[in-house]
């Protein structure tokens, strides 16, 4: 499985779209900052087998897609940008799915991978809960947008490391 330059370009486009999605000045939202406890260790990628890392990345994309495809999200962001964002995420998920199928045939994914995927799921649960508690306010969405941009950056870095291993 080769995470190609095309995939890398998709990553950059996803981050660019997220940057463009900004609706309000973030300087007004400092008091809404929140520690979502991003599962950093799941993206360090040193202890991972490749299949495991890919499935964690896939879960990250899937959860991001779920978060931004809710009714509340549609009301918060520009529809055209959201559509483009979905397309990029969908393309990345397809690439990663193809890789998982290819890699699992080569190596057995260890059970600890379930813990990694659970950590990502719980991270997104914390984000969803925060949005609910903040009543989906513009600042809450702005904080979440910044958080997702940061987590996607970690995903991109992990993918770069995987590409170097190829």
């Amino acid at each position: 499985c080769n995470l190609s330059q095309t995939h890398s370009l998709n990553n950059r486009r996803t981050l660019m779209l997220m940057a463009q999605m900004r609706r309000i000045s973030p300087f007004s939202c400092l008091k809404d900052r929140h520690d979502f406890e991003f599962p950093q260790e799941e993206f360090d990628g040193n202890q991972f087998q490749k299949a495991q890392a890919i499935s964690v990345l896939h879960e990250m994309m899937q959860q991001t897609f779920n978060l931004f495809s809710t009714k509340n999200s549609s009301a918060a962001w520009d529809e055209t940008l959201l559509e483009k964002f979905y397309i990029e995420l969908f393309q990345q998920m397809n690439d990663l799915e193809a890789c998982v199928i290819q890699e699992v045939g080569v190596e057995e994914t260890p059970l600890m991978n379930e813990d990694s995927i659970l950590a990502v799921k719980k991270y997104f649960q914390r984000i969803t809960l925060y949005l609910m508690e903040k009543k989906y306010s513009p600042c809450a969405w702005e904080v979440v947008r910044a958080e997702i941009m940061r987590s996607l950056s970690f995903s991109t870095n992990l993918q770069k490391r995987l590409r170097r291993k190829d």
């Epitope: 007004s28 400092l30 809404d32 929140h34």
Partner: antibody
Framework: EVQLVQSGAEVKKPGESLKISCKGS????????IGWVRQMPGKGLEWMGI????????RYSPSFQGQVTISADKSISTAYLQWSSLKASDTAMYYC??????????????WGQGTLVTVSS | DIQMTQSPSSLSASVGDRVTITCRAS??????LNWYQQKPGKAPKLLIY???SLQSGVPSRFSGSGSGTDFTLTISSLQPEDFATYYC?????????FGQGTKVEIK
């Protein structure tokens, strides 16, 4: 290694213009905001303003609004602080520092070494 | 604007002393409070962020506490290198504001 490197000391006359710089390295420059802080001789720290280099959105302290301009060039990972007409009271040490924006991370965790600006006739 | 008031403005202490500096905000700032140390001719250095989180690489003798309007920086056992000026700063809303500073001098 994260670094913020500021331009050298400046000696200027009242009424002159000036632009000082702060170059970031060792991290993603557009992922952090850059703040500017003034310290007049023998005095405390005063926050002047902040910029998001990803799109150059800027917020000033009311005390400095209209007195200075903060800008950034993300292509060269550099933020700027400029004056169009300096006054003797602008004599101070100016620091830049990075801020994590809306992400939960330490505020102003890295600082430049400071740029001493002296304004005297 | 949120005003930050530090006390005392200066204090004299000996090596090994326990030192406490307080910072009061003019309105509630939750836990959005940072502490910095500055030595003459040097840039400030972050010690504590989010009221009580110790910045990486900072000795554990430094600790922070408080939330709302009242905050404290404690140095459990003062070391020779701790003689400096300390500033609190709120990051709850812009304009971000600093306290006036507390100078810790040798007794």
């Amino acid at each position: 290694e994260v670094q913020l490197v500021q331009s050298g000391a400046e000696v200027k006359k009242p009424g002159e213009s000036l632009k000082i710089s702060c170059k970031g390295s060792g991290y993603s420059f557009t992922s952090y905001w850059i703040g500017w802080v003034r310290q007049m001789p023998g005095k405390g720290l005063e926050w002047m303003g902040i910029i998001d280099p990803s799109d150059s959105d800027t917020r000033y302290s009311p005390s400095f609004q209209g007195q200075v301009t903060i800008s950034a060039d993300k292509s060269i990972s550099t933020a700027y602080l400029q004056w169009s007409s300096l006054k003797a009271s602008d004599t101070a040490m100016y620091y830049c520092a990075r801020h994590p924006g809306l992400n939960w991370a330490p505020d102003f965790d890295y600082w430049g070494q400071g740029t001493l600006v002296t304004v005297s006739s | 604007d949120i005003q930050m008031t530090q006390s005392p403005s200066s204090l004299s202490a000996s090596v090994g002393d326990r030192v406490t500096i307080t910072c009061r905000a003019s309105q509630s700032i939750s836990s959005y409070l940072n502490w910095y140390q500055q030595k003459p001719g040097k840039a400030p250095k972050l010690l504590i962020y989010a009221a009580s989180s110790l910045q990486s690489g900072v000795p554990s003798r430094f600790s922070g506490s408080g939330s709302g309007t009242d905050f404290t920086l404690t140095i459990s056992s003062l070391q020779p290198e701790d003689f400096a000026t300390y500033y609190c700063q709120q990051s709850y809303s812009t304009p971000l504001t600093f306290g006036q500073g507390t100078k810790v001098e040798i007794k």
